[in-house]
Amino acid sequence: GSSPRSGVLLRGCPTHCHCEPDGRMLLRVDCSDLGLSELPSNLSVFTSYLDLSMNNISQLLPNPLPSLRFLEELRLAGNALTYIPKGAFTGLYSLKVLMLQNNQLRHVPTEALQNLRSLQSLRLDANHISYVPPSCFSGLH
């Protein structure tokens, strides 16, 4: 097996998820609507797309997706997230699309979004956010 590092593998498809390689030799991983309460283990470092929407994920630990430097789209819509800690998206250098709608967030996860230099699309609708500070997206380009 692989080095035991936070459930990341060189190759592999998480149990019950659907995985399909794309035209760039990277992996699209669909783990949506599986009743998951936490992020799946055995994610390939070569994952470019990860759909975790419509699950029951209530919290993210800091740095839950280490070394996923090819990840371009992360879908976490329709979960039970109330808070996203600083460092939750550390190392996601290529992340362009982040879907966080339909959760239970009360604040814009400003610190977690810092340094997502590639981010182009962010969805936070259908949460419990009542106030958006004027500088909360200042770390984005």
Epitope: G1, L9, L10, R11, G12, C19, P21, G23, S44, S67
Partner: antibody, heavy 116, light 107 residues
Amino acid sequence: EVQLVESGGGLVQPGGSLRLSCAASGFTFTSYSISWVRQAPGKGLEWVAEIYPPGGYTDYADSVKGRFTISADTSKNTAYLQMNSLRAEDTAVYYCAKARLFFDYWGQGTLVTVSS
Amino acid sequence: DIQMTQSPSSLSASVGDRVTITCRASQDVSTAVAWYQQKPGKAPKLLIYSASFLYSGVPSRFSGSGSGTDFTLTISSLQPEDFATYYCQQSYTTPPTFGQGTKVEIK
């Protein structure tokens, strides 16, 4: 131009050790994994070991686990395969290959012969 | 480990022939399959990846298809430089595994 150049092969006695090197150039070393794949004389291809340098992730075939160690030096863009407790069945041409999900470029190979 | 079984193990064909090689995985591997060409004394070369994507620089006479457990490599019109051994390989899980090879010889 992508280049992978293996070195370090040769004749070694059973139980002996060898260290293979794979010098990479022409691509971003930290954007790929490096694998070693071997081919015994007249036989097919067998994956041996792999490393993803940014995270230090490694993986091994069961046939070499505990005997072979893969490593990489990102400052030199070079991967290594330390082979200990060599057996006659380890005799093969050893190729290094760069990969994401698939092995898209291979070196020319280096021959390892284990014989007394 | 996932077993990859190729057929035939060898075939004889003429220049201009259409050649088909099949590969069967012992379990579902989605489309995580590649095909390689190897000539004697040389390193393998990637032809097809993700079951059906033609690798850069590979002639369009090569094509791949399949999903799940059954995969095919087709050479639409065999050329003299195509006489070689062809391997399929799965990357769905670790360890990545290869088929035993199909040798394409001149008839």
